[in-house]
């Protein structure tokens, strides 16, 4: 992963069976936030295990999170976003371990779309477009991307470029020609809010044009 | 090792309706966006709908409002409804499945074999 990624829980650095990390998205659904958790240890029983928050919360005290098969979530309008949330894993009344955590440092964007690669034949160049939800959310609205792009048939030989505009320009000259290539974007927060990579984009395929062999250029695609 | 399994292609004439379905052999994490690709004869492989846990569907513009993704988290099954169907969404289908990890899972990205769907009269 990328020098970028931080981890809002570092502050527990106790590991028992019942570790936990959890992940915020601001504005996931309308004025609706979400926070989503789960067991380190993907063996644990989770059977009669809940999770709880409190504090930090507006209207309430504790909210309860809901569970689908092994992960935990809620989705509400009453994070405050201004200091820490006590979040506790939790047998009946029992608390069995808790983390103190500030959910503006746990964000996880939501994953970035219409990813586009357009060939400018006079140019020379691709240009790589793609969308995020972000730009149009009062709160994770500034953002790093990491577009990476690889010949399909080179399984982990990736090319990363960080950016922080939606746009981007790729020089066919630093491009194998008539080769494949995926391509594909995620998002990290970058201004006041700290967290996690979003998940991938889908990828772009593309084909990039044969060397015209009389000039020594590409041909177009 | 996850195997997907795709079922519902087909041929089928212009402007009918065909289901895809993609099946999980085993257990993935409830997380990970499901995600279907076409490719068709001497293209490239292309995007066409994804969907979230939490049932966030995104669509390529060329399906919009023809195409309905829909996913079963406790089953880990994913369904494509295609309506309106023209020659040229033509192709093989593939399911694919994908975390970019966190929450102490490692990533991962599994594909299907594909279904091959064929809109012609």
């Known amino acids: 992963e990328s020098g970028y990624a931080q981890n809002g829980d570092l502050e527990d650095a106790e590991l028992d069976d019942y570790s936990f990390s959890c992940y915020s998205q601001l504005e996931v659904n309308g004025s609706q936030h979400s926070l989503t958790c789960a067991f380190e240890d993907p063996d644990v029983n989770i059977t009669n295990l809940e999770f709880e928050i409190c504090g930090a919360l507006v209207e309430v005290k504790c909210l309860n999170f809901r569970k689908l098969q092994e992960i935990y979530f809620i989705e509400t309008k009453k994070f405050l976003l201004i200091g820490k949330s006590n979040i506790c894993v939790k047998v009946g009344e029992k608390s069995l371990t808790c983390k103190k955590i500030d959910l503006t440092t746990i964000v996880k964007p939501e994953a970035p779309f219409d990813l586009s690669v357009v060939y400018r034949e006079g140019a020379n160049d691709f240009v790589v477009t793609f969308n995020t939800s972000h730009l149009q959310k009062k709160y994770v609205k500034v953002l790093m991307h990491d577009v990476a792009y690889r010949q399909e048939k080179d399984e982990n030989k990736w090319t990363h470029v960080n950016l922080s505009s939606t746009k981007l320009t790729l020089l066919q000259r630093k491009l194998q020609p008539a080769a494949m290539y995926e391509i594909k974007v995620r998002s990290i927060p970058d201004h006041y809010f700290k967290g996690f990579w979003s998940e991938w984009s889908p990828s772009y395929y593309f084909r990039t044009p044969e060397i015209n062999n009389s000039s020594g250029e590409m041909d177009p695609i | 090792q996850v195997q997907l399994v795709e079922s519902g292609g087909g041929l089928v004439q212009p402007g009918g309706s065909l289901r895809l379905s993609c099946a999980t052999s085993?257990?993935?994490?409830?997380?990970?966006?499901m995600t279907w690709y076409r490719q068709a004869p001497g293209k490239t492989r292309e995007f066409v709908a994804a969907?979230?846990?939490?049932?966030?569907?995104t669509y390529a513009e060329s399906v919009k409002g023809r195409f309905t993704i829909s996913r079963d988290n406790a089953k880990n099954t994913m369904d494509l409804q295609m309506d309106g169907l023209k020659p040229e969404d033509t192709a093989v289908y593939y399911c694919?499945?994908?975390w970019g990890g966190g929450l102490n899972r490692a990533p991962f990205d599994y594909w299907g074999q594909g279904t091959q769907v064929t809109v012609s009269s």
């Open positions: 969907i979230t846990w939490r049932g966030a569907a």
């Open positions: 694919n499945v994908k």
């Open positions: 085993g257990s993935i994490f409830s997380l990970a966006t």
